[in-house]
């Protein structure tokens, strides 16, 4: 039995649980998902039993090997997978555990502007990047467009201070998870500050 193997998959995609064995006479191989039987294989008996019928079309064994390929992944396929190789030649079964994380492909992140202060011609505000559908394990990075890849700020919230008369700079937020990344529409501090100031003036009027 080896250490737990961590695997990553994307919704709609496929993942292969790697498994090798040098056992000559394998009596059965049993795969379970969160303690529920998933597949039982009898290499000598010639049968493969997929416990739940809906999983039949999702289960495959690449190149006729022991590894299990699971396709059409869903979010709720995330969890613990366990395989046991049973053989009369083994005193106890050979086992392997896997942890699968299934992630969604990220949609375009949304940028919101926090409360703004405008003192002495300097507009100070927070820009917050977020996913509308509350996707998990998302990392956010801010980039200043045209400044090369190394000009960035890590984190969902970016504090900006834009002084009137300064050259405007396009900013974009990148959201990423283990299977995808996505960019927000570029935002311009000058435009955000000017729009906010206009809104404030119209409210006072």
């Amino acid at each position: 039995s080896g250490p737990v193997k961590e695997l990553v998959g994307s919704v709609g995609g496929a993942v292969t649980f790697p498994l090798k064995s040098k056992v000559k006479q394998v009596d059965s191989i049993v795969w379970t998902f969160n303690t529920t039987p998933l597949v039982t294989i009898q290499p000598e008996g010639g049968t493969i039993i997929v416990t739940q019928n809906r999983n039949r079309e999702r289960v495959d064994f690449p190149d006729g090997g022991y590894s299990l390929k699971l396709s059409k992944l869903k979010k709720n396929d995330s969890g613990i997978y366990y395989v046991g190789i049973y053989s009369s030649s083994l005193q106890q079964p050979s086992t392997q555990e896997y942890v699968l994380h299934v992630y969604e492909h990220l949609s375009k992140p949304k940028v919101t502007m926090g409360l703004q202060s405008n003192k002495n011609g300097t507009c100070v505000t927070n820009l917050t990047c977020c996913m509308e559908h509350g996707e998990e394990d998302v990392i956010y990075t801010w980039k200043a467009l045209g400044q090369g890849d190394n000009q960035f700020h890590d984190g969902a919230t970016l504090s900006i201070a834009w002084r009137s008369g300064e050259k405007d700079q396009a900013l974009t937020c990148m959201a990423r998870n283990p299977v995808s990344n996505s960019f927000s529409t570029p935002v311009f501090p000058q435009k955000l500050c000017e729009d906010a100031a206009t809104d404030l003036t119209s409210l006072r009027g």
Partner: antibody
Framework: QVQLQQSGPELVKPGASVKISCKAS????????MNWVKQRPGQGLEWIGR????????KSNGKFKGKATLTADKSSRAAYMQLSSLTSVDSAVYFC?????????????WGQGTSVTVSS | DIVMTQSHKFMSTSVGDRVIITCKAS??????VAWYQQKPGQSPKLLIY???FRYTGVPDRFTGSGSGTDFTFTVSSVQAEDLAVYYC??????????FGGGTKLEIK
């Protein structure tokens, strides 16, 4: 990639013996069963037997007992089948074929076949 | 030994047609049936194992089904390159493994 290369065609006299070879590459030869299958001209397929090169264990079709002897050499990654006391009914194409791991009775890679002709 | 019977020695079909080849086992073999394709002058090629599992790289127009004693192999939309002999084989439990007599698929 997996390849099974068989020895060339054989023309042998009745009563003689012949040994044909199957050289494997591209996979763990010792840990996969190797099968031998007979096909007479214009006929179907007949399973002769299989050998596990790791320890030389064999399983055979009773019909070929005393006719076919299966051996394997791990160091040269080759499987062999010797056919003895040949008669005209032994004239056929003989294939070696690797068993899949997941289903030992299903054969996924086949050699190109060795033609054996028994004629005086 | 288990006898595998393919009732049709020949089947004639047209490109684009759906064709079903049947195979009957003389006793219960659960789902332990494989299907092979053999083109003229070539070695057999594994298409299906354990009744319904498509081998890697096999086009999805080829499907297999059945359990017990009755098995079917279907080509959903026949292509010209599918001209071949198709064999069923039982790989149930202890050998000997046995093959059906083969069904030759001919294109009209």
């Amino acid at each position: 990639q997996v390849q099974l290369q068989q020895s060339g065609p054989e023309l042998v006299k009745p009563g003689a013996s012949v040994k044909i070879s199957c050289k494997a590459s591209g996979y763990a030869f010792s840990n996969s069963w190797m099968n031998w299958v007979k096909q007479r001209p214009g006929q179907g397929l007949e399973w002769i037997g299989r050998i596990y090169p790791g320890d030389g264990d064999t399983k055979s079709n009773g019909k070929f007992k005393g006719k076919a002897t299966l051996t394997a050499d791990k160091s040269s990654r080759a499987a062999y089948m010797q056919l003895s006391s040949l008669t005209s009914v032994d004239s056929a194409v003989y294939f070696c074929a690797r068993s899949t791991m997941i289903m030992t009775g299903a054969m996924d890679y086949w050699g190109q076949g060795t033609s054996v002709t028994v004629s005086s | 030994d288990i006898v595998m019977t393919q009732s049709h020695k020949f089947m004639s079909t047209s490109v684009g047609d759906r064709v079903i080849i049947t195979c009957k086992a003389s006793q219960d073999v659960s789902t332990a049936v494989a299907w092979y394709q053999q083109k003229p002058g070539q070695s057999p090629k594994l298409l299906i194992y354990s009744a319904s599992f498509r081998y890697t790289g096999v086009p999805d127009r080829f499907t297999g089904s059945g359990s017990g004693t009755d098995f079917t192999f279907t080509v959903s939309s026949v292509q010209a390159e599918d001209l071949a002999v198709y064999y069923c084989q039982q790989h149930y439990s202890t050998p000997p493994y046995t093959f059906g007599g083969g069904t030759k698929l001919e294109i009209k």
